[in-house]
Amino acid sequence: TPEVWVQVQMEATELSSFTVHCGFLGPGSISLVTVSWGGPDGAGGTKLAVLHPELGTRQWAPARQARWETQSSISLALEDSGASSPFANTTFCCKFASFPEGSWESCGSLPPSSDPGLSAPPTPVPILRAD
């Protein structure tokens, strides 16, 4: 069964910077990745980035840069402007559309005990949805 993992990481050098890493474990090729916060895409979540392997990438504030790390994983850099966007308590969701598997989504957040600069372990897929 395909699986999606999500890691949320606070940068050691800049405590206001966070990075969300997401990956797809499974066969098939990725056709689209959507990253949202506050819940799954289309279910109360707010879109932060969309990445397409050929058509490009797009991010929305407070996301700074969305990029492919491998053909099946992405990273999204975020700038926390303070109290208005408390990333430390936020859920981030990544939805991977792949052919021929369909769509798979998982969510994760920064562990409460996270030290700056330490990456959270792969989230044990609290939300996994196949469309």
């Epitope: 689209l32 969309v50 397409h52 050929e54 058509l55 490009g56 990438t57 797009r58 991010q59 929305w60």
Partner: antibody, heavy 119, light 107 residues
Framework: EVQLQQSGPELVKPGASVKISCKAS????????MSWVKQSHGKSLEWIGD????????SYNQKFKGKATLTVDKSSSTAYMELRSLTSEDSAVYYC????????????WGQGTSVTVSS | DIQMTQSPASLSASVGETVTITCRAS??????LAWYQQKQGKSPQLLVY???TLTEDVPSRFSGSGSGTQFSLKINSLQPEDFGSYYC?????????FGGGTKLELK
Amino acid sequence: EVQLQQSGPELVKPGASVKISCKASGYTFTDYYMSWVKQSHGKSLEWIGDVNPNNGDTSYNQKFKGKATLTVDKSSSTAYMELRSLTSEDSAVYYCAASGLPYVLMDYWGQGTSVTVSS
Amino acid sequence: DIQMTQSPASLSASVGETVTITCRASENINSYLAWYQQKQGKSPQLLVYNTKTLTEDVPSRFSGSGSGTQFSLKINSLQPEDFGSYYCQHHYGTPLTFGGGTKLELK
């Protein structure tokens, strides 16, 4: 056939505002973001920003924040751009352009609206 | 913001010739580079995206290449309808930025 029909040329005085329109047809209006692009005479293209027709959310090029305001009227499939506090630097042709997912390529373009700022 | 630098700014060529236009990005944009063609008095039209994918109805005499920060658009055997201006644009996040343009004129 996809069409983006823009409003006609504008001659406006310095300090005034202008609102130009872009009526979309031939596709589902909410499937494409609407970008606006400036082309000064004989010059290159500058992305002003775009608007999500589903909810009116906007993204702006920092350079045009405070200068341009982008809106949509879903019921008439029309996008609008208002330019304020106009100066001669704002004299240009302005294009609307529709962008499909992930909203970074301009797939369809309007014919352009010429704005001339002169006293 | 990502700066896009195009060269040459203008180019004169004859029908049947082959020309190459180059575009440089100020940072790595992977393969996310598009080209637009604009004919005199008309709107720009998307020609190429993802460095080398031609949009529908674009003739095969057009070809794109490059990656990272260096890209080029090559037009083989120029036809009369190819003359006009060409602009590169990255599609790697916002703000979207364009190159300064290359005006391709008939010699």
